[in-house]
């Protein structure tokens, strides 16, 4: 080890290690946590502050409208009464109380954040960790959704409602247990030495956890995706030999990809950036993440809010569900759907049956 | 090797203003807080503030808010203090110092500045 | 703020002595202590932090206790380089306070 200074041979630079005993601070002050971590805790509303909180409740009213509207389609459209349905109104659920629990971070973000203990802290956080869980889980249960749609050769699964409530009380639960693991233990309240910066009374560990555990599910989704769309790939190009069709081929497998596009690209675009911060802020002591953080928190927020327009807004069904909703008409042919109903655009399941199973189209 | 290198002595006028600065080597500047502390002749260690590179984010003893402002150059790995509207008061060695440990705030320090003596006189 | 009181304010000892010093807070600062060794013209170097870790290439014979309020640094078979200004501070947050002081001579 260098000596510290030139003035003393005696003392040379030091080997900090953690406090020989074990101390909790749990009825510490956050300006405590935060002061230790070097984030700025601001003590009086600034420009930023001001226009972070002016578009975030803008996004959340957004999102809580949006998601409520998806919801209430797929609960007065008997047409949506089929698992990928039920899915998509659990993604909104899980998207209305990321708005939620966004709403709640805003009234306590800034200045206020000074006014919370340690528990209102925690419970702040965990419903943010638990919304985007719940999201994210959500995204993936989709996601494997479409993927057994596909290779069983369905236009619906055969999942039973049973085994969808199952799911969805899976996704629940595993959003519930995610974002209450630091409030039952793991933080550095008792760990002051491995705080982080950007959540100053969490664990370096568990921001590491968390942005690994996420960015897997991401790569898990292009996987299955990718898988997806190499089977239909490969099933388009052996039928265009066999029939006359091969247009509209190109244009399920342009349809297709589109629509992964979309909802890969969203995912990327507003998660990406987030976690790659929450890596960099443990695994890089030279970077300044906290100048970046609430935007990126904001973006992966609009992940939320870009949710019910790409699995639902894109669907001509979903839109004129909405239609109904926000014009309080009645539905017409609340039975099935009209021979000419374009669902396939969006609802990636009815893309490729569209093309691959080209006779199943009209089964629901 | 670990180092704080400080500017010399500054001899100033009552009312002016000066500006101190702390050139760290041999480890990475923004990974540590910087702290700079006042004493005077014959007596004890007074906290004035700190700077953390990383964040730009800084903390004052409110004895010295509006009396020092403290900044950082990460090009140059350079801690500044400047302090103005200089009294006889003001009269004094100030060290700077760094942090114990890095990417957080401990509030102690391990590494020290040789110090800069400040004297104001007319 | 919290404030410092060390004790005593000057202490005369001879070589192989054993010294304690002694620091006061204001308030709860559970095991925020640093000890800190001053000579002469020279830079202050942190001894203890945390109450009681020694500092990397600090002689064991130095040792530091006490949590909360109360807290000392125990120097034992004092050595030459030994003697100085030891001063004692919290490092809880900001803002940071130091102990007057305790110059510690040789007899």
């Known amino acids: 080890m260098a000596a510290a200074s030139t003035s003393s041979p005696v003392i040379s630079q030091p080997q900090f290690t953690a406090m020989n005993e074990q101390q909790c601070f749990y009825n510490e002050s956050i300006a405590f946590f935060y002061n230790r971590s070097g984030k700025y805790l601001a003590t009086e509303w600034n420009t930023v502050s001001k226009l972070v909180m002016g578009l975030g409740i803008t996004v959340c009213v957004f999102i809580m409208l949006a998601n409520l509207l998806v919801m209430v389609a797929i609960y007065v459209n008997r047409r949506f009464h089929f698992p990928i349905y039920y899915l998509m109104a659990n993604l909104a659920a899980a998207d209305f109380f990321a708005g939620l629990a966004y709403f709640y971070l805003m009234f306590n973000t800034g200045p206020n954040t000074r006014r919370l203990t340690v528990s209102t802290w925690l419970l702040r956080q965990g419903l943010i960790d638990t919304s985007l869980t719940a999201s994210v889980a959500n995204l993936l249960a989709i996601a494997i959704e479409r993927h057994i749609t596909v290779f069983r050769m369905q236009l619906h699964t055969r999942m039973s409602n049973r085994r969808v409530v199952v799911v969805i009380v899976v996704i629940w639960t595993m959003a519930i247990v995610m974002g209450a693991i630091p409030s039952v233990g793991w933080n550095c309240i008792c760990d002051i030495d491995h705080c982080s910066n950007m959540a100053p009374l969490y664990s370096d560990s568990y921001l590491v956890f968390w942005a690994i555990f996420n960015l897997v599910t991401f790569v898990v989704m292009v996987v299955l995706y990718a898988h997806i769309f190499g089977y239909v790939r490969q099933r388009t190009m052996r039928m265009s030999r066999h029939s006359s069709g091969p247009r509209r081929n190109r244009d399920t497998m342009m349809s297709l990809l589109k629509t992964v596009v979309i909802v890969l690209g969203a995912f990327i675009v507003c998660w990406t950036p987030g976690l790659v911060l929450l890596l960099l802020d443990v695994c890089c002591p030279q970077c300044d993440v906290l100048a970046y953080e609430k935007f990126f928190l904001l973006l992966a927020e609009f992940n939320s809010a870009m949710n019910p327009i790409i699995y639902s807004y894109r669907d001509k069904e979903m839109s004129a569900t909405f239609r109904q909703i926000l014009c309080c008409q009645r539905n017409e042919n609340p039975n099935g759907p009209t021979e000419g109903s374009d669902r396939s655009a969006s609802s990636l399941n009815h893309t490729i049956l569209a093309g691959v199973h080209s006779n199943d189209h009209s089964v629901v | 090797q670990v180092q704080l290198q400080q500017s010399g002595a500054e001899l100033a006028r009552p009312g002016a203003s000066v500006k101190l600065s702390c050139k760290a080597s041999?480890?990475?500047?923004?990974?540590?807080?910087i702290s700079w502390v006042k004493q005077r002749t014959g007596q004890g260690l007074e906290w004035i503030g700190e700077?953390?590179?990383?964040?730009?984010?800084?903390y004052y003893n409110e004895k010295f808010k509006g009396k020092a402002t403290l900044t950082a150059d990460k090009s140059s790995s350079t801690a500044y203090m400047e302090l103005r509207s200089l009294t006889s008061e003001d009269s004094a060695v100030y060290f700077c110092?760094?942090?114990?440990?890095?990417?957080?705030?401990?509030?102690?320090?391990?590494?020290w500045g040789t110090g800069t003596t400040v004297t104001v006189s007319s | 703020d919290i404030h410092m009181t060390q004790s005593p304010a000057s202490l005369s000892a001879s070589v192989g002595e054993t010294v304690t010093i002694t620091c006061r807070a204001s308030?709860?600062?559970?095991?925020?202590l640093a000890w800190y060794q001053q000579k002469q013209g020279k830079s202050p170097h942190l001894v203890v932090y945390?109450?009681?870790t020694l500092t990397e290439g600090v002689p064991s014979r130095f040792s530091g206790s006490g949590s909360g309020t109360h807290f000392s640094l125990k120097i034992n078979s004092l050595q030459p380089e030994d003697f100085g200004i030891y001063y004692c501070?919290?490092?809880?947050?900001?803002?940071?306070?130091f102990g007057a002081g305790t110059k510690l001579e040789l007899k």
């Open positions: 110092a760094r942090e114990s440990i890095s990417r957080r705030l401990g509030w102690n320090f391990d590494v």
């Open positions: 041999g480890y990475t500047f923004t990974s540590y807080g």
């Open positions: 700077i953390y590179p990383r964040s730009g984010n800084t």
């Open positions: 308030e709860n600062i559970y095991s925020f």
């Open positions: 945390n109450a009681k």
């Open positions: 501070q919290h490092h809880y947050g900001p803002p940071l306070t």
